[in-house]
Structures are given as structure tokens and as C-alpha cells.
Amino acid sequence: FERTRSLQDPCSNCPAGTFCDNNRNQICSPCPPNSFSSAGGQRTCDICRQCKGVFRTRKECSSTSNAECDCTPGFHCLGAGCSMCEQDCKQGQELTKKGCKDCCFGTFNDQKRGICRPWTNCSLDGKSVLVNGTKERDVVCGPSPADLSPGASSVTPPAPAREPGHSPQ
């Protein structure tokens, strides 16, 4: 099949880094400067991506692979192949159209990107709040209130009894 295909289509023999040049009777030609083809059999080479402005070069373009960009400090990638850079915010904030805003009460964000999310509702799992939430951290749920009632077995062992006549240090 490969042999048949190459007889029918000479372009199928052109390797990555080249293109099938119609101006040269369909012979394979190397990609011109600042262009690439990452697969064989291409009829054109693609122009290399340029990482400009808020983008910076993570991997240089070559004749067989496109450049790869990431974002300058203070920004993070969004989209396939880092197609966009979005401003970082602080933990406890989210990015709005008006810039970085603190998370509303009852929500948190523990990253420099993304949106503020509601604190976990411990009571939905029948548990109680062990550590309160903040703008930067979710609440920590603890044992259910029933586990803390008198007579119930405690998760932590009881403190050793003090000898009489000694006050705590």
C-alpha cells in the first residue's frame, strides 16, 4: 500500500521538515526559515508561532516542530497550547472584569488562578466544622456533633489524670 500510495502521490514521501513543492514539480523542499512541518506529506510549511508580549518562549521553533509559549511571571496559561495568558491574583481572590477581587464571605480560593468556591458544608456529611474557613482556605470538617456528645467514644484519647496537689504548668 505504501508503495502504491507513493507512486500515486509523490508528496507522501516528503518527510517532516519539508513540504511538497508545486513550484518544483512536486519535489520535497526543506521548510523556509521560521516555518515548520511536523508530519510528512505536507504541501506547505506552517509559520512558526512567535511568543511576544505577555507570552514568552518555552521551546524554540524548529523546522519540524512549532514554538511553544508560556506566560511571563504574574500571568498563567489558558486554553490549548497556552493560547491565552490571564493575570494571576493572590490567594483569596478571583479575577473579575474589574481586576482581582477578594472572595466573598463563605467562599475561598487557594490558588493564584480560578474562581472563589464555596466552603464545604460540613453538615451535609453529618459533620461539624473543626477549623473555620477563610478567603484562602476551605473549612476543615471534623467528627459529627453526635461523636462529641458526652459518653460517646472520642477520637482522641483522654488526657492522663493529674496527681492531686499539682497545678498545671
Epitope: P30, P32, P33
Partner: nanobody
């Protein structure tokens, strides 16, 4: 325009070696892609080896492991070292620098 002149072709036995040279005259300093092609009788011209614009050497499957492309910018010369030559390597070999072609040099592999 750039003028290219190949040399180094000849008659060699199977398994032998040849070194082709391609001397350039004119302004070659902005030329970033160099390549060797060959054309066997009755066949289409084919790309054998090339130095891409990113200075990486590439080879057609038929040349991998046997041929080595190199260049010496101070001498304005490109080379193709051909080892372990086979009967099917018989062709006229052309050097190319973007839009300029040499006149070709004949390589014949025969016992």
C-alpha cells in the same frame, strides 16, 4: 544571486565512499537552508540531505546512517560524505541553496 558548483563525483565500487563538495560564490550569508538532491535516470529529483534553517541536519530514509551533510561557512562550501555506497545511489547529485542550483556531479556505483 548565488552560484553553486559541485565536485567530487566519480565511479566507485559498492561499499565505497565519496565526498561531494558544493562551492558557493556570491552573498551566501543570508542563506539559511542548504540541501543535496539527486536524480537517477528516468526518475524524479529527490531530496537526500539538508541543513535546515535551525542548523539541524536531516536525511532522507535512503541516506540515514550512511551519508553526512556538513558545511564550512568560512570556505562557503557544503559537503556530502557518502559511505557504504549502493548500486541504487547512482545518480546526478545537485546542491541547492534556496533558489539556486548547481550543475550537478555524476556519481556511479558499479562493480
Amino acid at each position: 544571486a548565488v552560484q553553486l558548483v559541485e565536485s567530487g563525483g566519480g565511479l566507485v565500487q559498492p561499499g565505497g565512499s565519496l565526498r561531494l563538495s558544493c562551492a558557493a560564490s556570491g552573498n551566501i550569508f543570508n542563506i539559511r537552508v542548504r540541501s543535496w538532491y539527486r536524480q537517477a535516470p528516468g526518475k524524479q529529483r529527490e531530496l537526500v540531505a539538508w541543513i535546515a534553517w535551525d542548523n539541524v541536519a536531516h536525511y532522507a530514509d535512503s541516506a540515514k546512517g550512511r551519508f553526512t551533510i556538513s558545511r564550512d561557512n568560512t570556505k562557503k562550501t557544503m559537503y556530502l560524505q557518502m559511505n557504504s555506497l549502493k548500486l541504487e545511489d547512482t545518480a546526478v547529485y545537485y546542491c541547492n541553496s534556496e533558489d539556486s542550483w548547481g550543475q550537478g556531479t555524476q556519481v556511479t556505483v558499479s562493480s
